[in-house]
C-alpha cells in the first residue's frame, strides 16, 4: 500500500488558447485531470488502473501552483494504491478549461481541452521528488512526482506491513526496509522476549521484563545462582534446591538434632567444663566447691575444716574465709605472726609491741611508709603539678617544672602574655593557652600589628557618573575626579542642577 504523489508547480499558456487553437473567453480557467495506470510502451486511452484525480480550477492561462498539502491536500495530488508497487507506471495529465462551475467530464464541451501530456517509465519508492517539464506548441507544464509507502508499509514495493508496538505481543519499531528493530531490553523474532539482568542464571532464572532476574522455585539471590534449603531444614544449607546439609554440630534429616549441646546451650554453671557426650547429652566437670548435673549446687567448703591453728571458717560466695586467732595469719591461718624480736621494721623504722607482744607496729622515718617501712614515699604519685607541669622528686621534697605560660609552686598560676602590651598601634591582645594573639585595627597587620597597610578607600566605588577615584594614602580617604558636566564630592550632581535641599 502506498501513494503516488504529483506536485503541479507551474502551467504556462501565454496566449490563453485551447488545444484547438481557439482562444478561451475571457481567459482559460484551467483545471487538471490526472490518470495513473500500469506501464504501457505507448500510452493509450483506457482505464486508469492505478487511479485518477481531478483538481479544482487552479488559475487562468499562466500561473504557478501553490503547495497546498496543508489545506486539504490538493497539491501535491494524492493517488493512493493498495497493491505492491510494480516499479513502473504510465501517467496522463490533461489541462482543461472550465467555462462554468461544473467540472464533470460530461458537463464540458469536448473542445475544452487545453493540453494533454503522457509519460511512462520506472519509478522506485522513495522520498525524493522527480522534477519534469513537458512543453507543447502553446503550453508548458512543470511538475514533480514520487511514490511513498502508506503508514506502516515498508520495503521497495510498499508490500511489507510493519506497525510499531510496545505491548505483550512485541516491543519494536520498524526499520526503513520493514524489518523489526527491537526496543532496548527486548529480543526474539517479534521482540517479545525480555533480555534478563546480565549474569542471570540461564536455567534457574527468568524475567518478564528487561534487566530483571526472577528465580525459579528453589533458587534465590540477585542472579538466581544460590539454592534455598528444604522447608523443614533448621540448621543446614544446600548446594542444590531443597537440600539440608547440616551446619557443624547439628545432625538429623532436617539438621534439628543438637550434636554440640555444650556450645549451643551452655548448660554447665559456675565455670564448670562442658563435654558433649552424644545427641542432646553432655557432662559437666565442676570446679571445686560445686556439685550437681550442671554444677549448679554450691558445696559448703567449711565442711572440710580448712582453717588451722584454731581459725574459724566462714562460707563466702566464692569459697570460704578463715578468721585467724591472734599470732596467726595466712589463707588457712597456717603462718605464725612476727614480733619485735624478729626486727621486722626496715629503713630505720622503730618497732612497738602491741597486744602483749602478739603483734607489732612500725614507726617509719620520713620518706618511708608501709607496715614494715619497706616503701619509699614518692611525693609525685598524687600528680600535684597543674597545667601539665612535670613533678620532680628532690630528696625529702618535690618540685614542679612548669610549662611556658604558667608559674607558682604547683604551676597553678597562668602568666599573662598580654601584661607587657605587646600589640602595636592600639591592637587588642588576647591571652591563649600557648601564647597570645593580636587583633589589629584597620590599616595595620602582622603578628603584633606592626605592619602598616593602606586602606583602599576606593574599594567601595564611592564616585558616581563614571568619575575616577583616587586614594589619599596620608589620610586613607578618597577623592573623586569628576567628568565634564558633573560636580560634588562624589560627582553626584549634574552641572546646572543644584542639589535640592529640604529647607
Amino acid at each position: 500500500s502506498g501513494v503516488f504523489q504529483l506536485q503541479l508547480q507551474e502551467f504556462i499558456n501565454e496566449r490563453g488558447v485551447l488545444a484547438s487553437g481557439r482562444p478561451c473567453e475571457p481567459g482559460c480557467r484551467t483545471f487538471f485531470r490526472v490518470c495513473l495506470k500500469h506501464f504501457q510502451a505507448v500510452v493509450s486511452p483506457g482505464p486508469c488502473t492505478f487511479g485518477t484525480v481531478s483538481t479544482p480550477v487552479l488559475g487562468t492561462n499562466s500561473f504557478a501552483v501553490r503547495d497546498d498539502s496543508s489545506g486539504g491536500g490538493r497539491n501535491p495530488l494524492q493517488l493512493p494504491f493498495n497493491f505492491t508497487w510494480p516499479g513502473t507506471f504510465s501517467l496522463i495529465i490533461e489541462a482543461w478549461h472550465a467555462p462554468g462551475d461544473d467540472l464533470r467530464p460530461e458537463a464540458l464541451p469536448p473542445d475544452a481541452l487545453i493540453s494533454k501530456i503522457a509519460i511512462q517509465g520506472s519509478l522506485a519508492v522513495g522520498q525524493n521528488w522527480l522534477l519534469d517539464e513537458q512543453t507543447s506548441t502553446l503550453t508548458r507544464l512543470r511538475y514533480s512526482y514520487r511514490v511513498i509507502c502508506s503508514d506502516n508499509y515498508y520495503g521497495d514495493n510498499c508490500s511489507r506491513l510493519c506497525k510499531k508496538r510496545n505491548d505483550h505481543f512485541g516491543h519494536y519499531v520498524c526499520q526503513p526496509d520493514g524489518n523489526l528493530s527491537c526496543l532496548p531490553g527486548w529480543t526474539g523474532e517479534y521482540c517479545q522476549q525480555p533480555i534478563c539482568l546480565s549474569g542471570c542464571h540461564e536455567q534457574n532464572g527468568y524475567c518478564s521484563k528487561p534487566a530483571e532476574c526472577l528465580c525459579r522455585p528453589g533458587w534465590q539471590g540477585r542472579l538466581c545462582n544460590e539454592c534455598i534449603p528444604h522447608n523443614g531444614c533448621r540448621h543446614g544449607t544446600c548446594s542444590t534446591p531443597w537440600q539440608c546439609t547440616c551446619d557443624e554440630g547439628w545432625g538429623g534429616l532436617f539438621c534439628d538434632q543438637d550434636l554440640n549441646y555444650c556450645t549451643h546451650h551452655s548448660p554447665c554453671k559456675n565455670g564448670a567444663t562442658c563435654s558433649n557426650s552424644g545427641q542432646r547429652s553432655y557432662t559437666c566437670t565442676c570446679r571445686p566447691g560445686y556439685t550437681g548435673v550442671d554444677c549448679e549446687l554450691e558445696l559448703s567448703e567449711c565442711d572440710s575444716n580448712p582453717c588451722r591453728n584454731g581459725g574459724s571458717c566462714k562460707d563466702q560466695e566464692d569459697g570460704y574465709h578463715c578468721l585467724c586467732p591472734p599470732g596467726y595469719y595466712g589463707l588457712h591461718c597456717e603462718h605464725s605472726t612476727l614480733s619485735c624480736a624478729d626486727s621486722p621494721c626496715f629503713n630505720g623504722g622503730s618497732c612497738r609491741e602491741r597486744n602483749q607482744g602478739a603483734n607489732y607496729a612500725c614507726e617509719c622515718p620520713p620518706n618511708f611508709t608501709g607496715s614494715n617501712c619497706e616503701k619509699k614515699v614518692d611525693r609525685c604519685t598524687s600528680n600535684p603539678c597543674a597545667n601539665g607541669g612535670q613533678c620532680l622528686n628532690r630528696g625529702p621534697s618535690r618540685m614542679c617544672r612548669c610549662r611556658p605560660g604558667f608559674t607558682g609552686t604547683y604551676c597553678e598560676l597562668h602568666v599573662s602574655d598580654c601584661a607587657r602590651n605587646p600589640c602595636a598601634h592600639g591592637g587588642t591582645c588576647h591571652d591563649l593557652e600557648n601564647g597570645l594573639m593580636c587583633t589589629c585595627p584597620a590599616g595595620f597587620s602582622g603578628r603584633r600589628c606592626e605592619v602598616r597597610t593602606s586602606i583602599d578607600a576606593c574599594a567601595s566605588s564611592p564616585c558616581f557618573n563614571r568619575a575616577t577615584c583616587y586614594t589619599d594614602l596620608s589620610t586613607d580617604t578618597f577623592v573623586c575626579n569628576c567628568p565634564y558636566g558633573f560636580v560634588g564630592s562624589r560627582c553626584e550632581f549634574p552641572v546646572g542642577l543644584p542639589p535640592s535641599f529640604p529647607w
Epitope: Q220, E226, N231, G232, H235
Partner: antibody, heavy 118, light 107 residues
Framework: EVQLVESGGGLVQPGGSLRLSCAAS????????MAWVRQAPGKGLEWVAT????????YYRDSVKGRFTISRDNAKNSLYLQMNSLRAEDTAVYYC???????????WGQGTLVTVSS | DIQMTQSPSSLSASVGDRVTITCRAS??????LAWYQQKPGKAPKLLIY???NLADGVPSRFSGSGSGTDFTLTISSLQPEDFATYYC?????????FGQGTKLEIK
C-alpha cells in the same frame, strides 16, 4: 523450636512511618530467605516483600515499591520492614515468615497489627 | 499476576466427614502449590507443599493432589481441631499469590 516474634506495630496517621522487627530463633537465620506477608482485617493473605539469605536481594509487591524496605541483620537474627508514606489500605496484621517468593512459607510469626488511620 | 480461585468459599461439615477443597490457577503452575491452615487470631500454618508433600508434624488425614491449574486439598476424616480457614498459594510465578480462602465450619 522455630520461633518468629514480630514487634513494632501500632496506630499511625496516613503518610506516617513505622518500622517492624522480627526476632528469629530455633534455626540458623543466616541460611534462609525471609519474607513479610500481610492480612487486612477480615481478608486473605497477601505477600509483601522478600529478602534472600545469600546476598540480601529484595523484592516487593507493586503497591509497596518505593515506600517499604525489607532488610535483615544476620548477626542479630533479625528481619525488618521499614514502612514509609503509609496509606489506609496498608492496615493489616503483618506476619514475618521464613521463605522466598518462589518457595512455601514454612514458618510464621504471630503477627503485629498496623493500623493506618487519621 | 496469577489468580488463585478457591471453591467453595465456605462449607459446613461434621466431625468424621471427608472434605475436599479445590484451588484453580489462572495459568499452569506445575506442582508449585502450598496449602495453609489458619485459625482465628492465629498465624497461618503450612500443611502441604509441592502439591502433595505433608509438612513436618501435619497429620496424615490431610492430603493434596493435582497439577497444572487444578488442585485439591482433602481431609479424610474431619477432627474438631480442623475447623479453620484454608488457603492455597502458588510459588511458581512472581509474585506469589494466595487464594481468597475457604472457611470450614462445624455443621
Amino acid at each position: 523450636e522455630v520461633q518468629l516474634v514480630e514487634s513494632g506495630g501500632g496506630l499511625v496517621q496516613p503518610g506516617g512511618s513505622l518500622r517492624l522487627s522480627c526476632a528469629a530463633s530455633g534455626f540458623t537465620f543466616s541460611n534462609f530467605p525471609m519474607a513479610w506477608v500481610r492480612q487486612a482485617p477480615g481478608k486473605g493473605l497477601e505477600w509483601v516483600a522478600t529478602i534472600s539469605s545469600s546476598d540480601g536481594t529484595t523484592y516487593y509487591r507493586d503497591s509497596v515499591k518505593g515506600r517499604f524496605t525489607i532488610s535483615r541483620d544476620n548477626a542479630k537474627n533479625s528481619l525488618y520492614l521499614q514502612m514509609n508514606s503509609l496509606r489506609a489500605e496498608d492496615t493489616a496484621v503483618y506476619y514475618c515468615a521464613r521463605g522466598y517468593y518462589n518457595s512455601p512459607f514454612a514458618y510464621w510469626g504471630q503477627g503485629t497489627l498496623v493500623t493506618v488511620s487519621s | 499476576d496469577i489468580q488463585m480461585t478457591q471453591s467453595p468459599s465456605s462449607l459446613s461439615a461434621s466431625v468424621g466427614d471427608r472434605v475436599t477443597i479445590t484451588c484453580r490457577a489462572s495459568e499452569d503452575i506445575y506442582s508449585n502449590l502450598a496449602w495453609y491452615q489458619q485459625k482465628p487470631g492465629k498465624a497461618p500454618k503450612l500443611l502441604i507443599y509441592d502439591t502433595n508433600n505433608l509438612a513436618d508434624g501435619v497429620p496424615s488425614r490431610f492430603s493434596g493432589s493435582g497439577s497444572g491449574t487444578d488442585f485439591t486439598l482433602t481431609i479424610s476424616s474431619l477432627q474438631p481441631e480442623d475447623f479453620a480457614t484454608y488457603y492455597c498459594q502458588q510459588y511458581n510465578n512472581y509474585p506469589p499469590t494466595f487464594g481468597q480462602g475457604t472457611k470450614l465450619e462445624i455443621k
